[in-house]
Interface confidence: low
């Protein structure tokens, strides 16, 4: 699997969409996990609803939200209020019992607010951040990474 690189602006939200074969993964919960270092388990951040038929409901852990459209075969993860510390390697997973199949590998990169690089005299209108879907950044490029992902918990 290639690693998808997603870039988001600090302070904004980043939405990650992982697509999968809806028939193959019928009945399976999905998860979003974070890779710490080069080895060891991919630590789960959040997973979809325990009742598969309710997977469309948003599940939240801290600033991370997950929801699964099981008919379309798309699981969406939103990282809200993106911070520099959120940068790193993640996986979208499909869960079957205690096994986890990697759907997609994602490298999240956090870009500094361009306001920091502007002249202080410039006026900026802040992004509307009150709505859940506000201030999304979905710039995505795909490139090969030299990172290996071991089996997960």
């Amino acid at each position: 699997l290639n690693t998808t690189v997603l870039q988001g602006m600090a302070g904004q939200s980043l939405r990650v969409s992982c697509t999968y074969d809806a028939l193959k993964h019928w009945g399976r919960r999905k998860a979003w996990c974070r890779q710490l270092g080069e080895e060891g388990p991919c630590q789960r951040v959040v997973s979809t609803h325990g009742v598969w038929l309710l997977a469309f409901l948003k599940k939240r852990n801290g600033s991370t939200v997950i929801a699964d459209d099981t008919l379309a075969g798309t699981v969406t993860i939103t990282l809200k209020n993106l911070q520099a510390g959120d940068a790193g390697l993640y996986q979208c997973q499909s869960l079957r019992g205690r096994e986890a199949e990697v759907l997609q590998k994602v490298l999240v990169e956090v870009l500094e607010d361009p306001l920091d690089d502007q002249d202080a005299g410039d006026l900026w209108v802040p992004e509307e951040s009150s709505s859940f879907e506000g201030a999304q950044v979905e710039h995505s490029t795909s490139r090969n990474q030299e990172t290996s992902f071991p089996p997960t918990s």
Partner: antibody
């Protein structure tokens, strides 16, 4: 023998800053992820932050994200925790710990350094 | 985040007795669970990792068991130096979290 020695703790006012250091010896520092864990007086343990061996990946608890910055200088075998916008609830003994083989298990700990945030 | 609940909060036993400490996770953490011992004024010390593996230099009287949501740390025969606070920690989910601790005190 693996040794971790924290320093930099002390008394600071709310809103202030402090930089903790952890000097490591007895192992190949750059080969291990490192972590900070804190313990408020009379309370349990709370994971704060971690950093990969190269320093390229950093991780934070929600309670400190945006205020604390973990970093390392592999040439000096030293781990750092820059703490800004400190709050009373950040008062704790801060331990640095080694993460063996990149699992977030903590196999060696320093003796800790006390950070007191009070006016 | 994953909540780890340890019980009992305090365990009063005599040297030579068997100690059984429990740690329950709010959802399955597979076998990614560790146990630590902490004595007053000291840093924690790793005892058990991956639920049942003893860390380097840990005596055989310490053993861990369990998987999923229910875990147990057993000290087969308490030595005087074993009276301390014991914490469990999960590292299957991000962020890593600790239990509230069980104090093993002399009866």
């Amino acid at each position: 023998e693996v040794q971790l020695l924290e320093s930099g703790g002390g008394l600071v006012q709310p809103g202030g800053s402090l930089r903790l250091s952890c000097a490591a010896s007895g192992f190949t520092f750059s080969s291990y992820a490192m972590s900070w864990v804190r313990q408020a007086p009379g309370k349990g343990l709370e994971w704060v932050s971690a950093i990969s061996g190269s320093g390229g990946s950093t991780y934070y608890a929600d309670s400190v994200k945006g205020r604390f910055t973990i970093s390392r200088d592999n040439s000096k075998n030293t781990l750092y925790l820059q703490m800004n916008s400190l709050r009373a609830e950040d008062t704790a003994v801060y331990y640095c710990a080694r993460v063996p083989k990149h699992y977030v298990v903590l196999d060696y700990w320093g003796q800790g350094t006390l950070v007191t945030v009070s006016s | 985040e994953i909540v780890l609940t340890q019980s009992p909060a305090t365990l009063s036993l005599s040297p030579g007795e068997r100690a059984t400490l429990s740690c329950r996770a709010s959802q399955s953490v597979s076998s990614y669970l560790a146990w630590y011992q902490q004595k007053p004024g000291q840093a924690p010390r790793l005892l058990i990792y991956d639920a049942s593996n003893r860390a380097t230099g840990i005596p055989a009287r310490f053993s861990g068991s369990g998987s999923g949501t229910d875990f147990t740390l057993t000290i087969s025969s308490l030595e005087p130096e074993d009276f301390a606070v014991y914490y469990c920690q999960q590292y299957s989910f991000f962020p890593p979290t600790f239990g509230g601790g069980t104090k093993v005190e002399i009866k």
